[in-house]
Amino acid sequence: KFSKQSWGLENEALIVRCPRQGKPSYTVDWYYSQTNKSIPTQERNRVFASGQLLKFLPAAVADSGIYTCIVRSPTFNRTGYANVTIYKKQSDCNVPDYLMYSTVSGSEKNSKIYCPTIDLYNWTAPLEWFKNCQALQGSRYRAHKSFLVIDNVMTEDAGDYTCKFIHNENGANYSVTATRSFTVKDEQGFSLFPVIGAPAQNEIKEVEIGKNANLTCSACFGKGTQFLAAVLWQLNGTKITDFGEPRIQQEEGQNQSFSNGLACLDMVLRIADVKEEDLLLQYDCLALNLHGLRRHTVRLSRKNPIDHHS
């Protein structure tokens, strides 16, 4: 339930934050889950715990596994799990999908690429940036704080961008790299009041109790690059992230461009292990842009399993 995936490369630094950390200053104990062995806090160890952070300096493939963190107080302990995977360095240039952080999109007016996870590290500017393994050079590229700015973005700027920086721990330096894809949105076009293609207004979606269910919110906003265009799901009028039910998550789909050239967005709502109480909720697919907001409401109903007679 309170688990987070983290990954890194061997011989690089990796720092992981306890998924259950709330306020700073609380005592946090770390354990290697498979053996229940306590992670030391002494910094002379290659892997050590430092409050809410677990540090691999540097990481080794054998460090892969699940780590338990317990945020302690006399009246309320809170437990989280960090699922850590350390990969061998690739000899070629390709960065495999499992090492990629979330994709970001840019346009001529907005082309910031943030370096993932950098806030966990003790680093100093400037960052080094690479595109498809080539060091970025030229006046169009500006490394600013923890992000890269590209001037006059063109479609050719799409690709995989890697940030590289040095983490300093007690005078010792460790390399860290992180990669994410960057896509470029077309500037030409127009925007319309959002049109929701799915779901239909007041649609009833049949689901089976105990099974998983997916709801797709799909809307089109015009042609070309869309500013402030978004699709999202709400539960009982509350954002999914604020509703706080881990079984119900939304996952951004691909930008779609239909044959008529319209720019559309998908948002998939995934409900794991559907429960009776999920049938009581109101699911709203919201599509919004500068023109306004359109809402389609979906409710779930129980799908009765078909009787099979011999």
């Epitope: 309170f2 200053s25 005592t27 006399p74 009246t75 309320f76 809170r78």
Partner: antibody, heavy 117, light 111 residues
Framework: QVQLQESGPGLVKPSQTLSLTCTVS?????????WDWIRQPPGKGLEWIGY???????YYNPSLKSRVTISVDTSKNQFSLKLSSVTAADTAVYYC??????????WGQGTLVTVSS | DIVLTQSPASLAVSPGQRATITCRAS??????????MHWYQQKPGQPPKLLIY???NLESGVPARFSGSGSGTDFTLTINPVEANDTANYYC?????????FGQGTKLEIK
């Protein structure tokens, strides 16, 4: 944004059971944290009644334990307080709140319950 | 139960001056390197608001004029400088064990 709102009768007769409900919006109460009831007699200080954790475990103030039940209605994202055999000394503003670790970081506005015949 | 005794019961301070409120616990609320004492502010007609947790940590969004200190059984909330809108009741609360208990409160008035 997490919001809590208390509801229930403002007047309860002596020896009866006080029943209050706290409706939580912006967060699922079964996901995490502990969900408290605290009361404050008019012009007096705060008294912790007890809480129920996201896991369903309950912890009560021993001074009230024999009379208190805190429960959760997950379908409505609500938690409730029942206090039996009330007397005039139970007249207070009753607050519901969220406890993260040790501290109550979100509170309802409170509801005044008067015990009187 | 751990009994928390606040002093003074009330005080009046001029704007720009320092206000100091103390809270004494009937037994130590410190263990494993942390002190499980917290401070709240309650303005008339409002619920309490968390100011300080673990004796000295400022809650997010609370002005740096508020600070906490202490360990073991003796704790202090300091407001420096005091402002006009600091008029309120202030409560300490411990979480060293169950039941959680509050101090009886200190009323701060601004002259």
């Amino acid at each position: 944004q997490v919001q809590l709102q208390e509801s229930g009768p403002g007047l309860v007769k002596p020896s009866q059971t006080l029943s209050l409900t706290c409706t939580v919006s912006g967060y699922s109460i079964t996901s995490d944290y502990a969900w408290d009831w605290i009361r404050q007699p008019p012009g007096k200080g705060l008294e912790w009644i007890g809480y129920i954790r996201y896991s369903g475990d309950t912890y009560y103030n021993p001074s009230l334990k024999s009379r208190v039940t805190i429960s959760v209605d997950t379908s409505k994202n609500q938690f409730s307080l029942k206090l039996s055999s009330v007397t005039a000394a139970d007249t207070a503003v009753y607050y519901c709140a969220r406890t993260m670790m040790d501290t109550m970081d979100y509170w309802g506005q409170g509801t005044l319950v008067t015990v009187s015949s | 139960d751990i009994v928390l005794t606040q002093s003074p019961a009330s005080l009046a301070v001029s704007p720009g001056q320092r206000a100091t409120i103390t809270c004494r616990a009937s037994k130590s609320v410190s263990t494993s390197g942390n002190s499980y004492m917290h401070w709240y502010q309650q303005k008339p007609g409002q619920p309490p608001k968390l100011l300080i947790y673990l004796a000295s940590n400022l809650e997010s969004g609370v002005p740096a004029r508020f600070s906490g200190s202490g360990s073991g059984t003796d704790f202090t909330l300091t407001i420096n400088p005091v402002e006009a809108n600091d008029t309120a009741n202030y409560y300490c609360q411990h979480s060293r064990e169950f039941p959680l208990t509050f101090g009886q409160g200190t009323k701060l008035e601004i002259k």
